[in-house]
């Protein structure tokens, strides 16, 4: 039976959520964000082999055409399926403000 | 001035909508789809250089971390921002049916 969550390439090689520890300098945010000064950035990294976490019909098509025409059509790509919100304290003209960003930290991943 | 739609790699090299002509056999659909027998598949193909069609804050972060840690963090990836619906005539146990698929043909593209 097909298992869309079993990685045929070996544990941890396929599309999944990774955490990367980053400073404001790493993110290019040092000039406008005050806090947090360190961020646990969650992002989607890994290969998208056939039938693994396919997001939709388009991903299936893309994989089939990639097999046929690998030089023309790339394999599906590991991207966020949803996001976790994150609060930043940022500089403003008049002081500081809290802003919630809804599209910053990946929550889970799929192949498109 | 930054232009999120100007490709620094040269015309047609960056993330954009491509059309790939495919048969039902190419798509692996020959056993369940009756029509159309040929599909103009629209998909997102191309590179995602810095600031090009960035979908959101996550894409910006990913690019900055890719620059810092290219072996760990991949560059953003060219994926559909939205889809066009497509109607397929497909085989059923009792005959045929028309089915609309909303996630089959890419309509426009961005980098995530």
């Amino acid at each position: 039976a097909r298992n869309g969550d079993r990685c045929p390439l070996g544990p941890g090689r396929c599309c999944r959520l990774h955490t990367v520890h980053a400073s404001l300098e790493d993110l290019g945010w040092a000039d406008w964000v005050l806090s947090p000064r360190e961020v646990q950035v969650t992002m989607c990294i890994g290969a998208c082999p056939s039938q693994f976490r396919e997001a939709n019909m388009h991903a299936q098509i893309k994989m089939n055409l990639h097999r046929l025409k690998p030089d023309t059509v790339p394999a599906p790509c590991c991207v966020p399926a949803s996001y976790n919100p994150m609060v930043l304290i940022q500089k403003t003209d008049t002081g500081v403000s809290l802003q919630t960003y809804d599209d910053l930290l990946a929550k889970d991943c799929h192949c498109v | 001035a930054r232009n999120g739609d100007r490709c620094p790699l040269g015309p047609g090299r960056c993330c954009r909508l491509h059309t790939v002509h495919a048969s039902l056999e190419d798509l692996g659909w020959a056993d369940w789809v009756l029509s159309p027998r040929e599909v103009q598949v629209t998909m997102c193909i191309g590179a995602c250089p810095s600031q090009f069609r960035e979908a959101n804050m996550h894409a910006q972060i990913k690019m900055n971390l890719h620059r810092l840690k290219p072996d760990t963090v991949p560059a953003p990836c060219c994926v559909p921002a939205s889809y066009n619906p497509m109607v397929l005539i497909q085989k059923t146990d009792t005959g045929v049916s028309l089915q609309t698929y909303d996630d089959l043909l890419a309509k426009d593209c961005h980098c995530v």
Partner: antibody, heavy 119, light 112 residues
Framework: QVQLVQSGAEVKKPGSSVKVSCKAS????????ISWVRQAPGQGLEWMGG????????SYAQKFQGRVTITADESTSTAYMELSSLRSEDTAVYYC????????????WGRGTLVTVSS | DIVMTQSPLSLPVTPGEPASISCRSS???????????LDWYLQKPGQSPQLLIY???NRASGVPDRFSGSGSGTDFTLKISRVEAEDVGVYYC?????????FGGGTKVEIK
């Protein structure tokens, strides 16, 4: 309305361990850090350590290193603080607090859990 | 560890009168971005602490404007312009420039 709901009071023997829970209800859990702060009777506040639930990465005050373990379960939006080798001076109210990394801004606190260590 | 020293230990106040609490740190709390990583908290009798001021001088959401924070480097002050009966409790400063986070010993504000 987001709340941090802590587990109930505990009475423990010296040398034993205690595990206190802190559940975030009604809001996002993963994108904040959870810190643990204790307050002995009639005393001030003392930061013990904290965790980034999104990654499970914890940090501890040197004073508690080796004796405290802070964990988080994203699926249940719950953070835990386990303190081992308890002694009478660990008798305190233990608070969890939500913050932005370790930059402070503890804008939300649990109501506290009283842990009494007595033989 | 950074040592935080508050004074006075106890502060009897008259409603309607101003009050001032001092907090000194053993190391500078001024970060390279020009902001001081110092918070002020109030613990009312029988309650959990509540955030009053963050980043040295910024009032938290819902905090009355009679509360203000000032100072830089190692010397900080919390002022209440006109004390009200509901302001009684223990006030703590906390440094967040580095781990471990450390609190001042507290200042007990009570009505005369």
């Amino acid at each position: 309305q987001v709340q941090l709901v802590q587990s109930g009071a505990e009475v423990k023997k010296p040398g034993s361990s205690v595990k206190v829970s802190c559940k975030a209800s009604g809001g996002t859990f993963s994108s904040y850090y959870i810190s643990w702060v204790r307050q002995a009777p009639g005393q001030g506040l003392e930061w013990m350590g904290g965790i980034a639930p999104i990654s499970g990465t914890a940090s501890y005050a040197q004073k508690f290193q080796g004796r405290v373990t802070i964990t988080a379960d994203e699926s249940t939006s719950t953070a835990y603080m386990e303190l081992s080798s308890l002694r009478s001076e660990d008798t305190a109210v233990y608070y969890c607090a939500r913050g932005l990394a370790y930059d402070g801004y503890f804008d939300l606190w649990g109501r506290g859990t009283l842990v009494t260590v007595s033989s | 560890d950074i040592v935080m020293t508050q004074s006075p230990l106890s502060l009897p106040v008259t409603p309607g009168e101003p009050a001032s609490i001092s907090c000194r740190s053993s190391q500078s709390l001024l970060y390279s971005n020009g902001y001081n990583y110092l918070d002020w908290y109030l613990q009312k009798p029988g309650q959990s602490p509540q955030l009053l001021i963050y980043l040295g001088s910024n009032r938290a959401s819902g905090v009355p404007d009679r509360f203000s924070g000032s100072g830089s480097g190692t010397d900080f002050t919390l002022k209440i312009s006109r004390v009200e009966a509901e302001d009684v409790g223990v006030y703590y400063c906390m440094q967040a420039i580095g781990v471990p986070l450390t609190f001042g010993g507290g200042t007990k504000v009570e009505i005369k």
